[in-house]
């Protein structure tokens, strides 16, 4: 009779995590007698998959009936692949003894696993920043294979360069995680900015998973600020104006100060939001220049977002004022902005003088 | 290792039915052939069925199609041989063999079971 | 059905001797390049217990002085040197359709 050999046809088999998976494997003779074995792996720590003879395999069936008559076909079906099923698998005809002794293994075959990746789960900065500062957003997804994958990054559907991505582990593994950190200049412009993680995949069939990040969360657009005199009203009393304009987050306290002293605290509440995402607010004290024997200085203090407040200051010239008439109006603008904001449009940057 | 055991030793009476268990352990039942052997005293081997225990298929000797009948429980590991309408000429050591390697052949015995048909 | 006819049905052998014992089929039992015969010993008191398989191939466990042959209709068991724990009834059995035996043939020491 011929010698046995024991065939595995396929050198690999790509299953889809979930599915089922069918290893071939026959034998060219009924001699010698004995069960088939399957294993994962080789050598001393290989793992028994199925055995013909004995043991409870409840993921494993052998394709063709066992007790067919003349049976050379050890195929078997292994049901719901995960992951962790990955490997090489090796048909293994066994003689019957006691115990029953190796005879000749199959060549193996690799099963790989396509597992889809998770969804991309973008996360941005623990705190805020400013306009033109650097900002890094981190992209992550697990659980794929096989281990090639491609990330792009964008920001409102244009592509970015500036990023770095690793997949790990660097060696063979059942699946892998891929994370990626992108940096993204900010403008003032950004608020209602959106940055994209786009991770394609073999298992996805040409439709990448995103994960998205609002820029929102991670930029702070500071406040201009103007102080202002309105017309002189007729009852000796002066109405002053503090606009605080184009800011980012709504987060804002405004503080009047006379002559240093707190006359009043606001903060900002259900602002109108700006077609760029950010808030104007508009606050006016009316300053009694009869109840002053002095020239006045008002000074608006806004504080944004937990930041150091920003000061505008404003004075009111008493002596400019005749008591008993409230016609003739003069006040001067003295104030310095402490920060000079810019953005973008009007070409200043923000510094402390 | 492959164990088949079974029954102990029956009298009937001509007319009766004996219905013989074999226990198997030491393997997968559904995966192979039980065979049933009859050997009368100072006589030959006499085949008189098999049965596949994954799907309960049934192959008869002619001779015995009518009066035996094959089943499996696969919850025990048992298989079950009944014989119907006994004469005095069944009186017989009774085999089961397990198949090992579907060659319809009888690789592993059980001891036997000896059935005495007498009035 | 195929009828197998053992030769002789007795047969007594020296300690040391060769054993020869022949079965033949009523028809061929091969099939596929296989040929379908089995022989099994039986000792007093005791199943029977597989020697051959497949007409030549020899049963783990057991002694290498037993060996089988023949193809088609015509097959031999033999015991090359016999020995006192080889006294025994043998019995050849086919599969090429469903299973017979031969009458048996018993071996005894001269």
């Known amino acids: 009779e011929e010698e046995l050999q024991v065939i595995q046809p396929e050198k690999s088999v790509s299953v889809a995590a979930g599915d089922s998976a069918t290893l071939n494997c026959t034998v060219t003779s009924l001699i010698p007698v004995g069960p088939i074995q399957w294993f994962r792996g080789a050598g001393p720590g290989r793992e028994l998959i199925y055995h013909q003879k004995e043991g409870h395999f409840p993921r494993v069936t052998s394709v063709s009936e066992s007790t067919k008559r003349n049976n050379m076909d050890f195929s078997i079906h292994i049901s719901n692949i995960t992951p962790a099923d990955a490997g090489t698998y090796y048909c293994v005809k066994f003689r019957k003894g006691s115990p029953d002794v190796e005879v000749k293994s199959g060549a193996g075959t690799e099963l790989s696993v396509r597992a889809k990746p998770s969804a991309p789960v973008v996360s941005g900065p623990a705190v805020r920043a400013t306009a033109e500062h650097t900002v890094s957003f981190t992209c992550e997804s697990h659980g794929f294979s096989p281990r090639d994958i491609t990330l792009k990054w964008f920001k409102n559907g244009n592509e970015l360069s500036d990023f770095q991505t690793n997949v790990d582990p660097a060696g063979k593994s059942v699946s892998y995680s891929i994370r990626s950190t992108a940096r993204v200049v900010l403008t003032r412009r950004d608020v209602h900015s959106q940055v994209i993680c786009e991770v394609a995949h073999v298992t996805l069939q040409g439709d990448p998973l995103r994960g998205t990040a609002n820029l929102s969360e991670a930029i702070r657009v500071p406040p201009f600020l103007e102080v202002t005199q309105q017309s002189m009203r007729a009852d000796n009393q002066v109405n002053v104006t503090c606009q605080v304009t184009k800011f980012y987050p709504q987060r804002l306290q405004l503080t009047w100060l006379e002559n240093g002293n707190v006359s009043r605290t606001e903060m900002a509440s259900a602002l109108p939001e700006n077609k760029d995402g950010t808030y104007n607010w508009t606050s006016w004290l009316l300053v009694n220049v009869s109840a002053h024997r002095d020239d006045v200085k008002l000074t608006c203090q806004v504080e944004h977002d937990g930041q150091p407040a920003v000061n505008k200051s404003f004075s009111v010239k008493v002596s400019a004022h005749p008591k008993e008439q409230g016609s003739n109006t003069a006040a001067e603008n003295t104030g310095t902005n402490e920060r000079d904001y810019k953005d973008d449009d009007d070409k200043h940057h923000h510094h402390h003088h | 290792q492959v164990q088949l055991v079974q029954s102990g030793a029956e009298v009937k009476k001509p007319g009766a039915s004996v219905k013989v268990s074999c226990k198997a352990s030491g393997y997968t039942f559904t995966n192979y052939w039980i065979n049933w052997v009859r050997q009368a005293p100072g006589q030959g081997l006499e085949w008189i069925a098999m049965i596949d225990p994954s799907d309960s298929e049934t192959h008869y000797n002619q001779i015995f199609k009518d009066r035996a009948t094959l089943t499996t429980d696969t919850s025990t590991s048992t298989a079950y041989m009944e014989l119907r309408s006994l004469r005095s000429d069944d009186t017989a050591v009774y085999y089961c063999?397990?198949?090992?390697?579907?060659?319809?052949?009888?690789?592993?015995w059980g001891r036997g079971t000896l059935v005495t048909v007498s009035s | 059905d195929i009828v197998l006819t053992q030769s002789p049905d007795s047969l007594a052998v020296s300690l040391g001797e060769r054993a020869t014992i022949n079965c033949r089929a009523s028809?061929?039992?091969?099939?596929?390049?296989?040929?379908?015969i089995f022989w099994y010993q039986q000792k007093p008191g005791q199943p029977p217990k597989l020697l051959i398989y497949?007409?030549?191939n020899l049963d783990p466990g057991v002694p290498d002085r037993f060996s089988g042959s023949g193809s088609g209709t015509d097959f031999t068991l033999t015991i090359s040197s016999l020995q006192a724990e080889d006294v025994a009834v043998y019995y050849c059995q086919h599969s090429r359709e469903l299973p017979t035996f031969g009458q048996g043939t018993k071996l005894e020491i001269k």
């Open positions: 063999a397990m198949d090992y390697g579907s060659l319809y052949a009888m690789d592993y």
């Open positions: 028809k061929s039992v091969s099939s596929s390049g296989y040929n379908y």
């Open positions: 497949l007409a030549s």
